[in-house]
Structures are given as C-alpha cells and as structure tokens.
C-alpha cells in the first residue's frame, strides 16, 4: 500500500533507502531539456516475489524539442538555478540489498535522468537520514523514518536528527577534534553525540546518493 505522503523533511539533511519494497514507484524524470518518450513509462515499479524482485519498466528520456505538444515554460525565479546533487558527508558504500527478500536494489541511472529522484514509497519502507556536506549530525534517537499504517491512514515516523552548520566540527564521527574531557563539552552536545554505529548504519545506505531524491511525472 502506497504511503499517502513523503518522508519528513529535515533541514540540511537528505534521506535514502537501503532497499525498496515491492510496490515502490520511481518516477521517470528527465533533466532540463529532455522529457520522457511519448510511449515511455510513467514510473519504474519494484515488482516480483519474496525470492526475487526487480524494477519493471524502463525510463527513457528524449530531447524535449522533438515533441510539439510539450512546452518548456520559464521556471519561477527561485527555480532557475540548476538542481544540485546533494553531497553526503562521505562516499556511500554499496550494500548487498539482494539479501533483503521482497526488496529492489537502487535502480541504475538512465540517460539524461533528472538530478532528483522521486519515489512513491509503500507502507513498511524505512529511509535513513544523513546531514549534507558541511553539516554535523546531532542525534536524539534514530536518524530514520518508517512509513506506518494507523487506522487506515499512513504516516511517517519523525527522525530524531538535527543538522548543525558547525563547519569546523564537520569531521566524521570518531574523528572529532581532541577534547580535554567529556565534561568540557556543553551539555546539549554531550547528549547528542553521533556514535560510530550510527554513522555506519548511515553509510550502509546505498552507493548512489543523488539529491533530494524526489520528482514525479504524469503525462
């Protein structure tokens, strides 16, 4: 069952799924100047059974100049800048997602794909959050969100993550500048330290961390 809305937005953070549950849609979005082919799929779908899952449909982009019923309009001023890939704090390491029955791997990129990926998640999906480059993670709990069904409605749990813009303390966890003693830290920071375990969980997310991971299309 599809989640009614998107995972929560955390300032200066981006999220990623380690694997995608069956029924997940990934919209076929194209970068500026390109569009889905006329007979192209609206989205890719994670499909299969408990033993093997894969992405059904393929996304294909073509130059938008080739279709006369499609116009490119001038975006609003705040949208005229190109969408940037959100960089993570460290290179993402691939994870063997085949070990998760009923889940699909991160789909490979397609030619002229948009910089953002738009997923429609299903109930039970978990996404993991990480601060973007230049921001430091402060945890008060799990940096993850799960889509849950309650009383016939879906909702995402709130990730317990704050990303602060302390550029001078942007080293990876475990690489903080030496401190005289834990007591030397402000109380608020002491209670919010990112553990190596937390970070390992985050870095296991998936190899290709692209932007804010969202975008949708209908035609």
């Amino acid at each position: 069952e599809l989640c009614d809305d998107d995972p929560p937005e955390i300032p200066h953070a981006t999220f990623k799924a380690m694997a995608y549950k069956e029924g997940t849609m990934l919209n076929c979005e194209c970068k500026r100047g390109f569009r889905r082919i006329k007979s192209g799929s609206l989205y890719m779908l994670c499909t299969g059974n408990s033993s093997h899952s894969s992405w059904d449909n393929q996304c294909q982009c073509t130059s938008s100049a080739t279709r006369n019923t499609t116009k490119q309009v001038t975006p609003q001023p705040e949208e005229q800048k190109e969408r940037k890939t959100t960089e993570m704090q460290s290179p993402m390491q691939p994870v063997d997602q085949a070990s998760l029955p009923g889940h699909c791997r991160e789909p490979p990129p397609w030619e002229n794909e948009a910089t953002e990926r738009i997923y429609h998640f299903v109930v039970g999906q978990m996404v993991y959050y990480q601060c973007v480059q230049g921001y430091r993670a402060l945890h008060r709990g799990p940096a993850e969100s799960v889509c849950k069904m309650t009383h016939g409605k879906t909702r995402w749990t709130q990730p317990q993550l704050i990303c602060t813009g302390e550029m001078e303390t942007s080293q990876f966890p475990g690489e903080e500048k030496p401190q005289a003693s834990p007591e030397g830290r402000p109380e608020s920071e002491t209670s919010c330290l990112v553990t190596t375990t937390d970070f390992q969980i985050q870095t296991e997310m998936a190899a290709t961390m692209e932007t804010s991971i969202f975008t949708t299309e209908y035609q």
Epitope: M25, R35, S39, N57, K71, V73, A114, H120, T215, T216
Partner: antibody
Framework: QVQLQQPGAELVRPGTSVKMSCKAA????????IGWVKQRPGHGLEWIGD????????NYNEKFTGKATLTADTSSSTAYMQLSSLTSEDSAIYYC???????WGQGTLVTVSA | DIQMTQSQKFMSTSVGDRVSVTCKAS??????VAWYQQKPGQSPKALIY???YRYSGVPDRFTGSGSGTDFTLTISNVQSEDLAEYFC?????????FGGGTKLEIK
Amino acid sequence: QVQLQQPGAELVRPGTSVKMSCKAAGYTFSNYWIGWVKQRPGHGLEWIGDIHPGGGYINYNEKFTGKATLTADTSSSTAYMQLSSLTSEDSAIYYCVSRNFANWGQGTLVTVSA
Amino acid sequence: DIQMTQSQKFMSTSVGDRVSVTCKASQNVGTNVAWYQQKPGQSPKALIYSASYRYSGVPDRFTGSGSGTDFTLTISNVQSEDLAEYFCQQYNSYPWTFGGGTKLEIK
C-alpha cells in the same frame, strides 16, 4: 495529508475565458506534476494535460491544445488552468490531480451559459 | 491514442457477492493501468496502480489483475458502500486515456 483544493463552480458566458485554480498542500509542490482531467456526463474522463511546477514543463493532450493553458505558481503552491473561447461543450467538471493520479481535487464545475 | 474499453456499462450484484469489472486496451500497455472508484457526487478515488497494487486505505476485497491488453478489477464480498462507477486508465503512452466506466448497482 495531501490536499488539492479547487473552487466549487464557475458560471461563464460563451466565447469568454475562465481560469480555475488548484491549491496544493501536504507535499512538496515543485516536485510533482499537476494534471487536469475533464469529466462530462456521457463522455467519461479525459486527460487534458499536466505541468511540472519545478521543472518548467507542460504537456497537453493534442485535443486540448489551444483550448487549455496550464500555469503554476510555486510561491502559493497553486496550479491554474485557463480555458478559452468557451462553448457548451466545455461545460464539465474539471479535476486537478497529483502524485501519479493518487490524489484528486474535488473538482470545479464549469457551466457555460448565456 | 490508446482506447480503453469497458464493455459493461452497468453491472448488478448483491451484497456479499463477487463481481469482476473488465477493461480492454486497444494495444499492449504492459501493467501501466490504474483503477478508480467514483461515488455519486464525489471525485474519483484511486484504488489500484500498476494493474494490481492497492493504494493505502483501499480494502483488500479490491483486487486488480491483468497485463498487456486485458485487465480486471475484482470486488469480493461486495458491500453496499461499493455502489459506484469504476474507471480504468492507461498511462503507458500519451495521451493518458480512461475507460468509459462501469456502474455497479447493488440489488
């Protein structure tokens, strides 16, 4: 929760134009296409076209090229559809849809009458 | 354009029965088909996407099946609240097109 709010009704004269709105809430407006669908009794549902507020693309069903004009304002999370040179054939309910047709507005009933 | 044909404009059933609404595409659309329910005076509600996947909040008595050109929406254990019109839609090729609708009547 995702919501698409549309005005209930518009009464317009033949030959004139009407511009209807669709205000989105509960999701990131600039990320998702907003589509428009026409419903007339005995004619079923017809897809008119859609617009990507963030990407700046518009797609039209060729049948509605010249009749419908789609726009969007990201600052107010509102999509608009203007219908021109109205005739009785344009009297219908017009729905806005989003998130791969998962979410539908309540529809705007357009009545073209002298 | 791809035509989506719902040959039965009306279907009559009783509470507790099982009913199947069919839809035929004029060409192969894979599984790129959705089903919608529209109750009198309301906007359409999405039931099924990709031929067989239910949207959240849709009772599991609604089941979609099919691929290629032939698709079916099955309602098992029909309830009085299922009185509505049901539409199929293809989104495999532009322009997206809908079936003409099948009205379900409860005896």
